[in-house]
Interface confidence: low
């Protein structure tokens, strides 16, 4: 099992966050998802900059809208339970960025679809993990 060092713990949490985001992307990109067209009409705010753990504040602020969009996707082919999923992501995000942070998120001018939003945060996790390893 992974060691208890702070770096290893951070890496594990980022891997879990990454996996959760990939789970959502897999679910909504599933060719059997009849709600995808409608889901793509929802707009998400993207961070102007996302290079450090404190920037996860921007993801945290978009978790409620993400849950609302995922609630649309409920069907027998969408196996993710939005409330459980978002709750888990929120716990990981809080642990990673720290709950005492006073960082104010700056958003880009352009909004994004759910797919673009998820891909942006997946890339964020991957890049941070790469620096840890």
């Amino acid at each position: 099992a992974p060691t208890s060092s702070s770096t290893k713990k951070t890496q594990l949490q980022l891997e879990h966050l990454l996996l959760d985001l990939q789970m959502i992307l897999n679910g909504i990109n599933n060719y059997k998802n009849p709600k995808l067209t409608r889901m793509l009409t929802f707009k998400f705010y993207m961070p102007k900059k996302a290079t450090e753990l404190k920037h996860l504040q921007c993801l945290e602020e978009e978790l409620k809208p993400l849950e609302e969009v995922l609630n649309l996707a409920q069907s027998k082919n969408f196996h993710l339970r939005p409330r459980d999923l978002i709750s888990n992501i929120n716990v990981i995000v809080l642990e990673l960025k720290g709950s005492e942070t006073t960082f104010m998120c700056e958003y880009a001018d352009e909004t994004a679809t759910i797919v673009e939003f998820l891909n942006r945060w997946i890339t964020f996790c991957q890049s941070i993990i790469s620096t840890l390893t």
Partner: antibody
């Protein structure tokens, strides 16, 4: 010690379903994602999907969408993988793996008429 | 899906030999590569993760290197217990995918 113990071998007829269990012990079951991987006789490893034992939600490889269901019982630290509409090409050893560093011993599922 | 291609598919070597197995990804996977060893009738065993980090308890004769699309597993001095099949695996992008395996046999 840290281990995953899987249920015993199964023989099924085409069209039937099989449910394989994987019981965790020696570590915090809910902390690590549980993957399922299968290996057909003489073949390589094929990822089927993953479940978050904490939240209970799962995602599956496209190939198995609609046929596989992964669930968990936190009270017994057990995850389950159910595969339906079995065909002969589903004959394989099915493994559970927690965090990739702990693997079950494998469960042979034979599909034959 | 990201394809993982291993080479060679099999090789014959003697105890004490230096053995190198390569794995190529169809697109960049950064350092998200792991190596597994599998013996007949047994579950795979994690050897290396994050390209080059040795799993606890794995002998130091095993090492991994590479980045992006090209990766290498090296066994510096092959031991009798190392004769097995080796798999690479990427977890950079879902779905997780494995190489087809490299069987290391006794010459």
């Amino acid at each position: 010690q840290v281990q995953l113990v899987q249920s015993g071998a199964e023989v099924k007829k085409p069209g039937a379903s099989v449910k394989v269990s994987c019981k965790a012990s020696g570590f915090t079951f809910t902390r690590y994602y549980m993957h399922w991987v299968r290996q057909a006789p003489g073949q390589g490893l094929e990822w089927m999907g993953v479940i978050n034992p904490s939240g209970g939600y799962a995602t599956y490889a496209q190939k198995f969408q609609g046929r596989v269901t992964m669930t968990r019982d936190t009270s017994t630290s057990t995850v389950y993988m159910e595969l339906s509409s079995l065909r002969s090409e589903d004959t394989a050893v099915y493994y559970c793996a927690s965090g990739w560093d702990v693997w079950g011993q494998g469960t042979l599922v034979t599909v034959s008429s | 899906d990201i394809q993982m291609t291993q080479s060679p598919s099999s090789l014959s070597a003697s105890v004490g030999d230096r053995v190198t197995i390569t794995c190529r990804a169809s697109q960049s996977i950064s350092s998200w590569l792991a190596w597994y060893q599998q013996k007949p009738g047994k579950a795979p065993k994690l050897l290396i993760y994050a390209t080059s980090t040795l799993e606890s308890g794995v002998p130091s004769r095993f090492s991994g290197s590479g980045s992006g699309t090209d990766f290498t597993l090296t066994i510096s001095s092959l031991q009798p217990e190392d004769f097995a099949t080796y798999y690479c695996q990427q977890s950079y992008s879902s779905p997780v995918t494995f190489g087809q395996g490299t069987k290391v046999e006794i010459k």
